[in-house]
């Protein structure tokens, strides 16, 4: 009978082991070991036993001890089991962005490692075990599917192998892959809300606001705002899970017509868009034309109001007949028309919305000078020593200068409070003079002496 010790050995790959072969008889005819492994006999042995050192054990092997005794030949095998940790434990790359609510498949590849019966593969979220499977195949591939929520954003996923040789080897061998960080996102199915003017006048500034709720992580969201070919530069305000992008837009005459306003919110690998039509229009203020802005009284004046060809105008609140872009009327200039305002209001319909403009012009009427009985009475009778204010108002445009003189030298103090004396009595020649000429009027002042009883 041939014996081998130890009958089973677990050793690391490339390791060495001492194996004792012994025969049951005292003087075996022959005693040895048969193995492809490099072996070295450790001397001295005994009459019926030999010790061998097997080195560089790379794979499982069954060295065989044999002995030849008088009662016959026999053999015995020792079982060498080689263990080694995997050479590669790798978690397949995660998608750059994973939508919340969609399942994520984790895939781990394990190359090498033995004995496979003692090798398990785990998929982990942080330190939490998601799945535990045995390694099968070369390379071994292990997969698991997990639901993804917002709380998985930034979570680390990894793959770990465990080579458990206990109780033979009092150690648990672990290999862990490089962790992969998951980026999750939530972009709602609703398009962004776009608030903007439906019509926008050339060379004026408008404000566009684009907002969207239910975004995660909101800080990663990007907003693109454009009007036609013009990219807008929005200021973005972030809320808990919402954003609002506000931009000013100024349009030029080249952009006149219908333009598309586009707001796109990009998150992860998805985009939500909203489009709106904006009508760009040009609407200069209407023109108010007077035949002449300054005329002499009695002159006929044509007041004309003209606006955008599609506009409807009103001149001093009176609609053009028929309604349209031009209105006019004729008037004979009177002094009362001096300083009169002529207002032209225009309404333009742009894509169903009404926009308004107006323009005002003033008429100057030249008249006078004029001295009327009403404003410059020809006769005053005042009691002596009373306080009086001589009044004489000259009218005209331009405003005339007024002088009232007695005997060409003595002035009547117009508009001043005076004490009536005998010297004030007499006839004054009042003269109103402007660039348009002069008029005169006689004014007599009578002074009543007090009666003494």
């Amino acid at each position: 009978q041939t014996s081998v010790f130890p009958p089973e050995v677990i050793l690391p790959r490339g390791g060495s082991v001492k194996v004792n072969c012994s025969a049951s008889c005292d003087q075996p005819i022959s005693l040895g070991m048969e193995t492809p492994l490099p072996k070295k006999e450790i001397l001295p042995g005994g009459n019926n036993w030999k010790m061998y050192e097997l080195s560089n054990v790379q794979e499982d092997s069954q060295p065989m001890c044999y002995s030849n005794c008088p009662d016959g030949q026999s053999s015995a095998k020792t079982l060498l089991t080689v263990y080694w940790t995997p050479e590669r434990v790798e978690l397949a790359p995660l998608p750059p962005w994973q939508p919340v609510g969609k399942n994520l498949t984790l895939r781990c590849q394990v190359e090498g490692g033995a004995p496979r019966a003692n090798l398990t593969v785990m998929l982990l979220r942080g330190e939490k075990e998601l799945s535990r499977q045995s390694a099968v195949g070369e390379p071994a591939e292990v997969t698991t599917t997990v639901p993804v929520g917002r709380d998985d954003h930034g979570a680390n996923f990894s793959c770990r192998t465990e080579l458990d040789l206990r109780p033979y080897v009092l150690k648990l061998f672990e290999n862990t892959s490089a962790p992969h960080q998951l980026q999750t996102f939530d972009l709602p199915a609703t398009p962004p809300q776009l608030v903007s003017p439906q019509v926008l006048e050339v060379d004026t500034q408008g404000t566009v606001v684009c907002s969207l709720d239910g975004l995660f992580p909101v800080s990663e969201a990007q907003v693109s705002l454009a009007l036609g070919d013009q990219k807008l530069n929005p200021t973005i305000t972030y809320g808990n899970n919402s954003l609002s992008a506000k931009a000013s837009v100024k349009v030029t005459a080249e952009e006149e017509g219908t333009q598309q306003l586009l707001c796109g919110v990009m998150l992860g690998n998805q985009t939500q868009e909203t489009r709106q039509t904006v009508t760009i229009y040009s609407f200069p203020a209407p023109n108010v034309n007077l035949t002449k802005p300054e005329v002499s009284e009695g002159t006929e004046v044509i007041v004309e109001c003209e606006a955008h060809p599609r506009a409807k105008v009103m001149l001093n609140g009176v609609p053009a007949q028929p309604p349209g872009p031009r209105a006019q009327f004729l008037l004979k200039a009177t002094p009362e028309d001096n300083g009169r305002s002529f207002s032209c209001s225009a309404t333009l319909e742009v894509a169903g919305q009404l926009v308004h403009k107006n323009q005002t012009r003033e008429l100057r009427v030249l008249y006078g000078p004029r001295l009327d009985e009403k404003d410059c009475p020809g006769n005053w009778t005042w009691p002596e020593n009373s306080q009086q204010t001589p009044m004489c108002q000259a009218w005209g445009n331009p405003l005339p200068q007024l002088k009232c003189l007695k005997d060409g030298t003595f002035p009547l103090p117009i508009g001043q409070s005076v004490t009536v004396t005998r010297d004030l009595e007499g006839t004054y020649l009042c003269q109103a003079r402007s660039t348009r000429g002069e008029v005169t009027r006689e004014v007599t002042v009578n002074v009543l002496s007090p009666r003494y009883e």
Epitope: G317, P323, S345, G352, H356, N358
Partner: antibody, heavy 122, light 110 residues
């Protein structure tokens, strides 16, 4: 000045229908005209408008379902493919006014027709 | 779009009482607002235009006020003939996709 609708009747779903609004006492070349409808027991719902020059604008829900056109004295509302939800009284209204104080025109339904009833039923 | 929000949807008032109906525009419509009332089987009748101007033949018991986005219709000394549905209408825009009328207010006179 008056406005009167006609053409309302009982139709089966999908049968095209045209309503006519006849105006008198004013010219359609000077005014905008709107169509408004009212389903039984419901509020007023603006359908669309035609301008003095013939431009048309529609409520978002009415786009593609209704077409407004006009002649010198009539304004037509065509219901392309009526459904039971289109059962309503249809009104035609003059929708244009001006304010002599500001000198501006604005939309205002100052003149209405009595309405015409459209019933869509299988 | 100019959304018109009318409140309340329904109101009950005693004869001789006062009723107030509010209309809010989502954007400024200046003073371009009209008020209508409608009785069953009849077309709407304009009561007030330009926010506060009384239409001809309309009782001075009806008073409109407001500008910009907030408007009010007040009916004082309510009569049984005032029982109707009241609507506000913006006169600023008839763009594609526009909202023109408020949702209406039913006035019930007790």
């Amino acid at each position: 000045q008056s406005v009167e609708e006609s053409g309302g009747r009982l139709v089966t779903p999908g049968t095209p229908l045209t309503l006519t609004c006849t105006v008198s006492g004013f010219s359609l070349s000077n005014y905008y005209m709107s169509w408004v409808r009212q389903a039984p027991g419901k509020g007023l719902e603006w359908i669309g408008i035609i301008s003095d020059s013939g431009s048309t604008y529609y409520a978002s829900w009415a786009k593609g379902r209704f077409t407004i056109s006009k002649t010198s004295t009539t304004v037509d509302l065509s219901i392309t493919s009526p459904t039971t939800e289109d059962t309503a009284t249809y009104f035609c209204a003059r929708d244009w006014s001006y304010d002599s104080t500001s000198g501006y025109y604005y939309y205002d339904m100052d003149l209405w027709g009595p309405g015409t009833l459209v019933t869509v039923s299988a | 779009a100019y959304d018109m929000t009318q409140t309340p949807a329904s109101v009950e008032v005693a004869v001789g009482g006062t009723v107030t109906i509010k209309c809010q525009a989502s954007q400024s419509i200046n003073s371009w607002l009209s008020w209508f009332h409608q009785k069953p089987g009849q077309p709407p009748k304009r009561l007030i235009y330009k926010a506060s101007t009384l239409a001809s033949g309309v009782s001075s018991r009806f008073k409109g006020s407001g500008s910009g986005t907030q408007f009010t219709l007040t009916i004082s000394g309510v009569e049984s003939a005032d029982a109707a549905t009241y609507y506000c209408q913006q006169g600023y825009s008839r763009s594609d996709g526009e909202h023109v009328f408020g949702g209406g207010t039913e006035v019930v006179v007790k």
